[in-house]
Interface confidence: low
Amino acid sequence: RKIPKVGHTFFQKPESCPPVPGGSMKLDIGIINENQRVSMSRNIESRSTSPWNYTVTWDPNRYPSEVVQAQCRNLGCINAQGKEDISMNSVPIQQETLVVRRKHQGCSVSFQLEKVLVTVGCTCVTPVIHHVQ
Amino acid sequence: GITIPRNPGCPNSEDKNFPRTVMVNLNIHNRNTNTNPKRSSDYYNRSTSPWNLHRNEDPERYPSVIWEAKCRHLGCINADGNVDYHMNSVPIQQEILVLRREPPHCPNSFRLEKILVSVGCTCVTPIVHHVA
């Protein structure tokens, strides 16, 4: 899917837009809000009834190079006694983010935007049960 | 920036780090993944820490539509379907990268922007502070 131009019948392109070759776009990778920090409750990955672990994936040809992925620790959920209850399910919650991929073709370098699906954490759900007729 | 191994046969002019500004192909790789969480799963309703999804729409951003989760309850839903306030529903937040039109309203000029989104909720045991 191409990044949409501003899809409005009334829209006038500002005069100040930089010239861009056809089929490509100019991307400044100096991140706005670079120093913003997540302010989640402490250790929720361990305190959750559907706890998870984090794994850092590293790819030098991706920007950002580091992407953190969560994995649910259990198939079931942790009950009040601290035991796994398999009548409930721990399931991953996912979110898309954008990354920039650097591609090498011979000595030339090109850049491609890529959607990456990140597993953010896990939640405990009641399972869907399909009854056999 | 990030360091990359370079083909030894190539001229040595390329910076090891990503340049500050790059020209990017307009087509997005992996573009067909489902962006609407309501369509991709019903976890938001089936969770013991259910959440509502709020639509945030901004044509100056790509993707222009982002869904934000808000936990429905302070507590969690127990086996009887009631809210148990001995447990807490808390949002799971994630920093994601989006594109911001820069200068504003330009069709093919963007800057990466980091935004914080609440993706869903999870049920946690509360932190209890005992008074000495």
Epitope: G7, F10 | N36
Partner: antibody
């Protein structure tokens, strides 16, 4: 020329049903989100419902939730509003309106094209 | 009772500037762009301003809009007799999960 033409209004008794239609022309109907907005006599504008370009998402005002259904037939370039369990307070001119930008937008560019409206009177 | 509050009326003489305010909350104006509509008696509403302060083609530059925090405003400079109409602000509301209109402001051109 971009046009929206509502029809189906009339006088109806409380508790009865009515179906409004909105015929679209002059633009690619299947690319745009669509709204219904109403205006009671001598009163302000009240939003009723919105439907996404492909019909997959629908939202309603609390005052009509569970009674009204918004739908669309992209092959016929037509928007519908099915109104059940009508009440006297539903008496109004009903307008259909097009979202100003194509694709997955509901509101960022406003409602740029409006029909002339169709009058619904709920009275015994 | 609308969640977006507007003054019921505003007036001015030809050539004057009239401002209309629209006050909301964090769940609507605080998060989403505001649109403005003009409705002359007996006609359908017309989009006057979108995305806080952008004019559709055909709308004179005498109309300007701004938005900050949880409020927005519409200014009409060089007021003309044809500006006599009802004006509505509108935006999306996250709490109500829907589009909401302001209560409306009737602008009267005096003299």
């Amino acid at each position: 020329e971009v046009q929206l033409l509502e029809s189906g209004g009339g006088v109806v008794q409380p508790g009865r049903s009515l179906r409004l239609s909105c015929a679209a022309s002059g633009f690619i109907f299947s690319n745009y989100g669509m709204h219904w907005v109403r205006q009671a006599p001598g009163k302000g504008l009240e939003w009723v419902a919105v439907i996404s370009y492909d019909g997959s998402n629908k939202y309603y005002a609390d005052s009509v939730k569970g009674r009204f259904t918004i739908s669309r037939d992209n092959s016929k370039n037509t928007l519908y509003l099915e109104m059940n369990s009508l009440r006297p307070e539903d008496t109004a001119v009903y307008y259909c309106a097009k979202v100003g930008a194509s694709g997955d937008y509901y509101y960022s560019y406003g409602l740029d094209v409006w029909g002339q409206g169709t009058t619904v009177t709920v009275s015994s | 009772q609308s969640v977006l509050t507007q003054p019921p009326s505003a007036s001015g003489t030809p050539g004057q500037t009239v401002s209309i305010s629209c006050s909301g909350s964090h769940s609507n104006i605080g998060r989403h762009p505001v649109d403005w509509y003009q409705q002359v008696p007996g006609a359908a509403p017309k989009l006057l301003m979108y995305y806080g302060g952008y004019r559709p083609s055909g709308v004179p530059d005498r109309f300007s809009g701004s938005q900050s925090g949880t409020s927005a405003s519409l200014a009409i400079s060089g007021l003309q007799s044809e500006d006599e109409a009802d004006y509505y602000c509108a935006t999306w509301d996250d709490r109500l999960v829907g589009y909401v209109f302001g209560s409306g402001t009737k602008v009267t051109v005096l003299g």
